[in-house]
């Protein structure tokens, strides 16, 4: 017979967990003993089953773990794992601090969408990567010309909405342009908005004429000469 002991104490060295609100937290207390010990959890010294917690908790006894998803400020506290068997018991305290993030305008990854050059008839993907605490919505816009002008009397550009979606729908951050033609050339804007405000970045698509397959086949190396 053997009292409980920690099997991976090096994985338990991080005592203080300071986590942004909305993130997932996982506490682990991997242990062993003979007989095999049981694990239970306390929050601030009281038995913790997560029944009062929105979203509940996940206890994975075989992994000696406690998982809380989408943490909120009320989850702050001291979490104790109590591991015991008939021979003895051990405990370990984790401290959880939940950091309240300030919701901000969407942040767009620098350099996206990127300026792109394509050949007539090819397919193009324009990417836009968005970081936002508040759920963002995205629009892909194409800048267009009306009566020979790109701008209205108010000084703002003429734009056409190509695609609108919320970020959680699939492929919302990618604009697919199939079988591009010369008319597809121009400026494209990825616009992301949330309850705080809007952010947008633009890129240019250049469409080159279709290559002559005969010329390409006859002198392929010519494409790489200066």
């Amino acid at each position: 017979q053997q009292a409980p002991y920690w099997t991976h104490p090096q994985r338990m060295e991080k005592k203080l967990h300071a986590v942004p609100a909305g993130n997932t937290v996982k506490f682990r207390c991997p242990a062993a003993g003979n007989p095999t010990p049981t694990i239970r959890w306390l929050k601030d010294g009281q038995a913790f089953h997560g029944e009062n917690r929105i979203g509940g908790i996940r206890l994975r006894h075989q992994h000696w773990s406690l998982v809380m998803e989408s943490v909120v400020p009320s989850d702050r506290g001291t979490y104790t794992c109590l591991v015991e068997n008939a021979v003895g018991s051990i405990r370990y305290n984790y401290l959880l601090d939940v950091l309240e993030r300030s919701p901000h305008r969407p942040i767009l990854q620098a350099g996206l969408p990127a300026n792109t050059t394509a050949v007539v008839g090819s397919d193009v993907e324009l990417l836009c990567k968005v970081y936002s605490d508040a759920q963002p919505h995205i629009q892909w816009l194409k800048h267009i010309v009306i009566n020979g002008s790109s701008f209205g009397a108010d000084g703002f550009p003429y734009v056409q909405v190509l695609k609108t979606a919320d970020i959680n729908s699939s492929e919302v951050e990618v604009l697919y342009l199939r079988n591009v033609s010369a008319e597809d050339a121009g400026e494209y804007t990825c616009l992301a908005g949330n309850s705080i405000g809007l952010s947008y970045q633009s890129a240019w698509l250049t469409v080159l004429p279709e290559e002559d397959p005969t010329w390409t086949a006859a002198a392929p190396e010519a494409r790489y000469t200066d």
């Epitope: 734009v159 309850s195 705080i196 809007l198």
Partner: antibody
Framework: EVQLLESGGGVVQPGRSLRLSCAAS????????MHWVRQAPGKGLEWVAV????????YYADSVKGRFTISRDNSKNTLSLQMNSLRVEDTAIYYC?????????????????WGQGTMVTVSS | DIVMTQTPLSLSVTPGQPASISCRSS???????????VYWYVQKSGQPPQLLIY???NRFSGVPDRFSGSGSRTDFTLKISRVEAEDVGVYYC?????????FGGGTKVEIK
């Protein structure tokens, strides 16, 4: 004409509740986030809360968190602010303000249109 | 929270003379999209605030060109090139980059 018109203000005792409304007209209300901003007598401006265009996201100033609830009814073009457990320090003019829209910003992306405000006085 | 500090508290200006109001933010208001999200308002007696300048230096529609905004990152200035009697009011700067949105304490402009 783009317009925001607040109502529901009045005199109320500390600890009581009040519900403010803001009627929007002249623009597609359901496409804009909306804010409440307040101003205590003789003081500066303080942001209170925001709600996203579809009502799915709401954020509050720490001073009102847990007491005030912002909501909207897009079918009626109406923004609301439910104020519970009112305190003397909540006494202010409450302004309804248009926030960011969903499309390309032809000008500022919000905080361009303000209502005339409604006065809330919390006093015993 | 981002703190907006405005100076001076009040300003008495002779008509036709210039006026300048400063605003400092505790964090940079330059966003990843290259825009600086500081707004300027004037509030005239008994009225709601009116937008003058957005995104650092853009004049809102209908705002006279004697009003201009400038600055970078954390230091911002609103200038009135030639003050007129109708410019009397309290001027506020505001950061519009993250919640809670915050305002400067205000600068009261009066005519000498």
């Amino acid at each position: 004409e783009v317009q925001l018109l607040e109502s529901g203000g009045g005199v109320v005792q500390p600890g009581r509740s009040l519900r403010l409304s803001c009627a929007a007209s002249g623009f597609t209300f359901s496409s804009y986030a909306m804010h409440w901003v307040r101003q205590a007598p003789g003081k500066g401006l303080e942001w209170v809360a925001v709600i996203s265009y579809d009502g799915s996201n709401k954020y509050y100033a720490d001073s009102v968190k847990g007491r005030f609830t912002i909501s909207r009814d897009n079918s009626k073009n109406t923004l609301s602010l439910q104020m519970n457990s009112l305190r003397v320090e909540d006494t202010a003019i409450y302004y309804c303000v248009r926030g960011a829209g969903r499309g390309f910003p032809y000008g500022p992306d919000g905080f361009d249109i303000w209502g005339q405000g409604t006065m809330v006085t919390v006093s015993s | 929270d981002i703190v907006m500090t405005q100076t001076p508290l009040s300003l008495s200006v002779t008509p036709g003379q210039p006026a300048s109001i400063s605003c400092r933010s505790s964090r940079s208001l330059l966003h990843s999209d290259g825009k600086t999200y500081v707004y300027w308002y004037v509030q005239k007696s008994g009225q709601p605030p009116q937008l003058l300048i957005y995104e650092l230096s853009n004049r809102f529609s209908g705002v006279p060109d004697r009003f201009s905004g400038s600055g970078s990152r954390t230091d911002f200035t609103l200038k009135i090139s030639r003050v007129e009697a109708e410019d009397v009011g309290v001027y506020y700067c505001m950061q519009y980059i993250e919640a809670p949105l915050t305002f400067g304490g205000g600068t009261k402009v009066e005519i000498k």
